[in-house]
């Protein structure tokens, strides 16, 4: 999906109002310095591409993020404010269903959510030069 035509300001507002709080809740009890940010993005469409991938695609050691509250609200925001997004997800979701059976918070998942927080922060500051 090409995120170029999304309403970035509305997605940002939804993130600041509620998604960010859900990410913090997920990470509660974890030190903010515990994980190094290794995933980066260069502009808002690129950030949303990386956020989508990290939120919804199962990875080794963390298959369950798509069932978390922040993921549900992220999906809602992308579907509402990115034209045609929900239609493109039909085939993609079917491929992921088997990997989503249980919700287990592993250290790998905590690291992945820490990366997500970094991507969202970068999304909110689009004019900053890439480090």
């Amino acid at each position: 999906y090409d995120f170029t035509n999304c309403d970035f300001e509305k997605i940002k507002a939804a993130y600041l109002s509620t998604i960010s709080k859900d990410l913090i809740t997920y990470m509660s009890g974890t030190k903010s310095t515990e994980f190094n940010n290794t995933v980066s993005c260069s502009n808002r469409p690129h950030c949303l591409t990386e956020i989508q991938s990290l939120t919804f695609n199962p990875t080794a050691g963390c298959a369950s993020l798509a069932k978390e509250m922040f993921a549900m609200k992220t999906k809602a925001a992308l579907a509402i404010w990115c034209p045609g997004y929900s239609e493109t997800q039909i085939n993609a979701t079917q491929a992921m269903k088997k990997a989503r059976k249980s919700k287990v918070t592993t250290n790998k998942c905590l690291e992945q959510v820490s990366q997500l927080q970094g991507l969202w922060r970068r999304f909110n500051r689009p004019l900053l030069k890439q480090q």
């Epitope: 509305k10 507002a13 939804a14 600041l16 109002s17 509620t18 709080k21 859900d22 913090i24 809740t25 798509a66 069932k67 509250m69 549900m72 609200k73 999906k75 809602a76 925001a77 579907a79 509402i80 997004y85 929900s86 239609e87 997800q89 039909i90 993609a92 979701t93 079917q94």
Partner: antibody, heavy 121, light 108 residues
Amino acid sequence: QVQLVQSGAEVKKPGASVKVSCKASGYAFSSYWMNWVRQAPGQGLEWMGQIFPGDGETNYNGKFKGRVTMTRDTSTSTVYMELSSLRSEDTAVYYCARGGYVNFLYAMDYWGQGTTVTVSS
Amino acid sequence: EIVMTQSPATLSVSPGERATLSCSVSSSISSSNLHWYQQKPGQSPRPWIYGTSTLASGIPARFSGSGSGTEFTLTISSLQSEDFAVYYCQQWSSYPLTFGGGTKVEIK
């Protein structure tokens, strides 16, 4: 304007199944999660689960797992909630409620009129 | 699961008086995830207050919401006849979504 219109009242025998429908109009159906909430007579509200019409993804309340199935038909903008192995305690009004951002806060912003399901032998 | 406890179960108030409804949450949640709904007999619930303190469209200013963490409050500064109803709090912080048992505001 957003409207959620539910199917009519049902009377079922214990052990049977019931399928309630909720037809949506006035918004982009595929883009909003739909929730199902029930209310037993004289009781409070109980969340059963939700479905994302765009891809059919579901999140269920563990209390109903194995008994509840939520599906959707995008061609008619309708979501369905099927509850099986009915017992008398399932007698309730069943509501569909859209999940949406209001002032960028996420909540159930529109509700159907409710469907009364009576389970009686 | 997060347990929502509302008190009192029934509140008897005279028109023009102030009403305070409480919602206690079993574990701390963000204020953005606490909502209130109003329900009248034979009707569907209606969104009333979003995110602890934001009034839904068309809700009169005599209603207000406050709180944080585990304690939240809905206040009606001067009760009008149309305010007599049941009010439910609800959290959207973690699954399963849960509602309080409701507070019935009745005419004294």
